[in-house]
Every structure is written in structure tokens, then in C-alpha cells.
Interface confidence: low
């Protein structure tokens, strides 16, 4: 009778084992071991026992001891079970960003590992087990479906293998895959709201605002704002689930025409875009041309208004005839025209919008001087010793210099409060003088003596 020791072995892959083959008869004709494994016989006294060192055990094996005794031949097998942890434990690659509400399939692949009966594959979210299955097949594959939720954002999913050899008196061997960090996101189906001027004048700045609500996580949203090929640099402010990107846009003559304004919001692996057209236009203020800005009374003045070739102008509220970019007004300058404003209003249609520009010029009319009865009465009669203020106002542009003298020397104190005396009586010659000429007017002051009763 042949026996073997040990009859069952669980050993690490590549390990060695000492196997003893024995026979019950004292003088066996034959005693040995049959195995494809490298073996080395250890010398022992006696004939009925042999010890072999089996090395580099890579897989499960069943070496067989045999003996040939007088009563016949017999065999005995030992069962070598090799254990090893998997060579590869990994989650199938997935995009790191997943939209909320999507079914996400986690797939764990396990290559190698033995004994398979003791090998379990566990899918985890953090430390929470999602699925546990025995490893079957090569490679073994375990899958589970997860409905992506907002609170999964930043969660780590992993796959763990458990080679449980504790029932065999060994330990629990664990191998864990590299974690997959899930980034969840919500990008609404509505495109971003883009608020911008529909038309923008060359050499001016406009403000563009792009906003979107219902984003998660809003801080991860990327905003791209561009006008044509010009990337804008927005200032982004975030709310709980919204953002607002505000940018200044400057345009030059090179940008003139229709430009495309784009706001793209990128979150996760999705994007939403809004396009708008902005018309860049050039429209200088109209030109108001006076033949001369300063003229003498009675001069004929031409007021011209000229604007952009496609503009329509009105001069002092009256449209050009025929309607177009030029208007003209002709007048004879009167004192009433001094300080008169000539306003040219030009209107240009740009992309369906009416743009208005104004220019105003003021006409200065030189006239005078004037001294008339209303403002410089020719006769004053005042009681003696009363308080009076002689008034005489000369008119003209430029304002005339006024002097009122009696006998060429005695001045009348115009605009000053005086006590009326006899010397104030008499005829004064008031002379108003300016660059436009001079006028004179006689003013008589009568002084009434008090009556004594």
C-alpha cells in the first residue's frame, strides 16, 4: 500500500514543497514519484520511504507516488493547489464626467488569481459594496449599473478582489484597482442666455453678458466668449447653480461689418452654445459748418449739415430735402440770432436699429451798441434828498462800455444808489461804445426842491 504526505497542498505560485512517498512493505521493488515538476530526492535511511523536494510550482498539480511490493503495485496522489493574487484588477476606463441621471456601467476585469473558488470580485463606491461575485472566466468580469446622482460627485469607485484562504488556515489577500473618481454634472438643455448690443460703434466698448442657470457643479463650468476671432476675457460670477460671465468688447474699424458673437459653456463632456450677430458700424457725428461762427448783424449766414453718406439729417428739426446726408439753412443774422444753436441730427439705420448722432454749433452775432428809451429813459425827475439809482442799460455784442457825462466831466453814477442833490440836475450825454461802433443819448435829470409851508 502506497501513501503520500501531504495529500493536499495549497502553496504560493512558484513555491516548493517536500513530498514523502511511503510504502507498507519493507522491501519494495520500486518506490518513487511521478510529476512534471522539478524534483530533488532527499536521502533518508531505510527502503520504504522517500522524500522529494518539488520546486517552482506554477499551477495546480497532482504528483503521484507509486510502489511495487510483493503483493502488487499501488499509487497515491497528492493535490497541490497553487494560490496567487490577480495580476490585473482594473475598472474599464470611463469618461471622468458623467451626466446626472445617466446609467453608468462599471465593469471590473480581473486577470489571473487562484484558486478561483476562493476568489471574489467586489465593486465598491467608497467603502460601500455595490456588487460581490465570484471570479469566473479569464479574464473574470463583473459589471454593475449605477444611476448617476448629483451626490455621487467626487465619489471614488473601485474594484477589489478577495482571495479568502482563511478556511485553509491562510489569510485574506486583497487587491484593489486604481480608483475611478466620478465627476457628475448637470448641463441644462437650454442654451446660455447672451445679452449684448445688436449694434456696436467702431472705437467704442460694449458689454456682453452670458449666463446660464441649473448647472452642477457650477464652479467647473468653462465659459468661452468670442466676437469673431477675438477671444473675450470675461469676469465670471457664480451663484449656487448659475453663473454670469461679463466681458468688455472693444471694436475697431477692422471689425466693421457683421460679426458672430459666441458664448459656449463647457461642462463635463458636453457643451451648450449661443450665437448672436453683432453689427459693427462706423458713424461719426454729423458736421455743422457755419460760414463764420461770428458775424455782424445783417450778414447772410449759411449753415451746412453733413453726415455719413447713408445717414438722413435734420437741421434744427427740419429734414433735408430731398431726404439725405446733407442739409443747408440760409439766414440773415439778426441780434436775436446771437447765441442761437444750430443742431444737426443724423439718423443711420444699422441692422434694423436707428442710430442718432447730433452736433450743435452756436452762432455769435455782433451788433449794437443800442441805447433806447426802455432801458435808458431820457428824463428823470427826482425829489431832492431822496435815494435814487440812475439806470441806463446799453445793449450790444460785445457788451458796450457806457459813460454818462454832464458838461463832459461830471459823471452820472449809473447803477449806484445816490442821495439826490442840486448838482445832480442837468443834461447828461450817455455814450455807449463797442468794437461795433458807438451811440449817444441825452438824459436829463430834474431835481424837485422840497416845499416849505
Amino acid at each position: 500500500q502506497t501513501s503520500v504526505s501531504p495529500s493536499k497542498v495549497i502553496l504560493p505560485r512558484g513555491g516548493s514543497v517536500l513530498v514523502t512517498c511511503s510504502t507498507s512493505c519493507d522491501q519494495p521493488k520500486l518506490l518513487g514519484i511521478e510529476t512534471p515538476l522539478p524534483k530533488k530526492e532527499l536521502l533518508l535511511p531505510g527502503n520504504n520511504r522517500k522524500v522529494y523536494e518539488l520546486s517552482n510550482v506554477q499551477e495546480d498539480s497532482q504528483p503521484m507516488c507509486y510502489s511495487n511490493c510483493p503483493d502488487g503495485q499501488s499509487t497515491a496522489k497528492t493535490f497541490l493547489t497553487v494560490y496567487w493574487t490577480p495580476e490585473r484588477v482594473e475598472l474599464a476606463p470611463l469618461p471622468s464626467w458623467q451626466p446626472v441621471g445617466k446609467n453608468l456601467t462599471l465593469r471590473c476585469q480581473v486577470e489571473g488569481g487562484a484558486p478561483r473558488a476562493n476568489l471574489t470580485v467586489v465593486l465598491l463606491r467608497g467603502e460601500k459594496e455595490l456588487k460581490r461575485e465570484p471570479a469566473v472566466g479569464e479574464p473574470a468580469e463583473v459589471t454593475t449599473t449605477v444611476l448617476v446622482r448629483r451626490d455621487h460627485h467626487g465619489a471614488n469607485f473601485s474594484c477589489r478582489t478577495e482571495l479568502d484562504l482563511r478556511p485553509q488556515g491562510l489569510e485574506l489577500f486583497e487587491n484593489t484597482s486604481a480608483p475611478y473618481q466620478l465627476q457628475t454634472f448637470v448641463l441644462p438643455a437650454t442654451p446660455p442666455q447672451l445679452v449684448s448690443p445688436r449694434v456696436l460703434e467702431v472705437d467704442t466698448q460694449g458689454t456682453v453678458v452670458c449666463s446660464l442657470d441649473g448647472l452642477f457643479p457650477v464652479s467647473e463650468a468653462q465659459v468661452h466668449l468670442a466676437l469673431g476671432d477675438q477671444r473675450l476675457n470675461p469676469t465670471v460670477t457664480y451663484g449656487n447653480d448659475s453663473f454670469s460671465a461679463k466681458a468688455s468688447v472693444s471694436v475697431t474699424a477692422e471689425d466693421e461689418g457683421t460679426q458672430r458673437l459666441t458664448c459656449a459653456v463647457i461642462l463635463g463632456n458636453q457643451s451648450q452654445e449661443t450665437l448672436q450677430t453683432v453689427t459693427i458700424y462706423s458713424f461719426p457725428a454729423p458736421n455743422v459748418i457755419l460760414t463764420k461762427p461770428e458775424v455782424s448783424e445783417g450778414t447772410e449766414v449759411t449753415v451746412k449739415c453733413e453726415a455719413h453718406p447713408r445717414a438722413k439729417v435734420t437741421l434744427n428739426g427740419v429734414p433735408a430735402q430731398p431726404l439725405g446726408p446733407r442739409a443747408q439753412l440760409l439766414l440773415k443774422a439778426t441780434p436775436e440770432d446771437n447765441g442761437r444753436s444750430f443742431s444737426c441730427s443724423a439718423t443711420l439705420e444699422v441692422a434694423g436699429q436707428l442710430i442718432h448722432k447730433n452736433q450743435t454749433r452756436e452762432l455769435r452775432v455782433l451788433y449794437g451798441p443800442r441805447l433806447d428809451e426802455r432801458d435808458c429813459p431820457g428824463n428823470w425827475t427826482w425829489p431832492e434828498n431822496s435815494q435814487q439809482t440812475p439806470m441806463c442799460q446799453a445793449w450790444g455784442n460785445p457788451l458796450p462800455e457806457l459813460k454818462c457825462l454832464k458838461d463832459g466831466t461830471f459823471p452820472l453814477p449809473i447803477g449806484e444808489s445816490v442821495t439826490v442833490t442840486r448838482d445832480l440836475e442837468g443834461t447828461y450825454l450817455c455814450r455807449a461804445r463797442s468794437t461795433q461802433g458807438e451811440v449817444t443819448r441825452k438824459v436829463t435829470v430834474n431835481v424837485l426842491s422840497p416845499r416849505y409851508e
Partner: nanobody, 123 residues
Framework: QVKLEESGGGLVQPGGSLRLSCAAS????????MGWYRQAPGKQRELVAR???????AYEDSVKGRFTISRDNAPNTVFLQMNGLKPEDTAVYYC?????????????????WGQGTQVTVSS
């Protein structure tokens, strides 16, 4: 309504003369510059001569010494006396005027054009 009416065009032999007239009518207060433009087939319209209110005249180089522009402010008429005509003077001649019309709130200037008169210089 302002109207400019040209007359005096026609067929003339090289070296010959023509006198074009243009009369302005309508609610005219006064007329600033008046002028003559011409357009030969397949070419751009070009200024021939222009005359201001006070009678200052300006001419296109090719017509200097041959053409004379004049005006009569009383009946609002402008004339173009064309002497020494050449085949290259063949064109439609248009009258142009900056006309001031009286409006309720002031006077307005408009640039008006006539319908054109054909001048053909050929032997």
C-alpha cells in the same frame, strides 16, 4: 417741388459749339452752387464745371479754355458754353444745383439733378 430742366444738347461736328441751358423751377428761395456733370457710356459720372452763387467758376482740366459756365440768378438758370468740341466730349450732360427751398421753420438746401441732355460730337 423743385425741377431742373436741361436743353441745348445735340449732334455737332468736332470743333463745333453748343450752349447748354438748365432752368430750375419750384419753391426755390435761392440757389448756391450750380454745375454740369457728364457721363460717357460705361464710365463714371464726372464733374465738368461748377459755379458758385457769387459767380466763381471751376472746371475739369480737359475742358479748361474751351467751356465756359455762367449763371443768371434772376430766372435761376445755369449755362454751359461749349466751344472746340471733341469726340471725347460725347456724353449725357447733367445739370446739378444746390437749391435752397423755403420751409415752415427755415430754409433747406437740396442737391438736385436734371434728367440729362445728350451731346454727340462726330464727323
Amino acid at each position: 417741388q423743385v425741377k431742373l430742366e436741361e436743353s441745348g444738347g445735340g449732334l455737332v461736328q468736332p470743333g463745333g459749339s453748343l450752349r447748354l441751358s438748365c432752368a430750375a423751377s419750384g419753391s426755390i428761395f435761392s440757389i448756391n452752387d450750380m454745375g454740369w456733370y457728364r457721363q460717357a457710356p460705361g464710365k463714371q459720372r464726372e464733374l465738368v464745371a461748377r459755379i458758385t452763387r457769387d459767380g466763381s467758376a471751376a472746371y475739369e482740366d480737359s475742358v479748361k479754355g474751351r467751356f465756359t459756365i455762367s449763371r443768371d440768378n434772376a430766372p435761376n438758370t445755369v449755362f454751359l458754353q461749349m466751344n472746340g468740341l471733341k469726340p471725347e466730349d460725347t456724353a449725357v450732360y447733367y445739370c446739378n444745383a444746390e437749391i435752397i427751398t423755403t420751409q415752415t421753420l427755415g430754409r433747406m438746401l437740396g442737391e438736385y439733378w436734371g434728367q440729362g441732355t445728350q451731346v454727340t460730337v462726330s464727323s
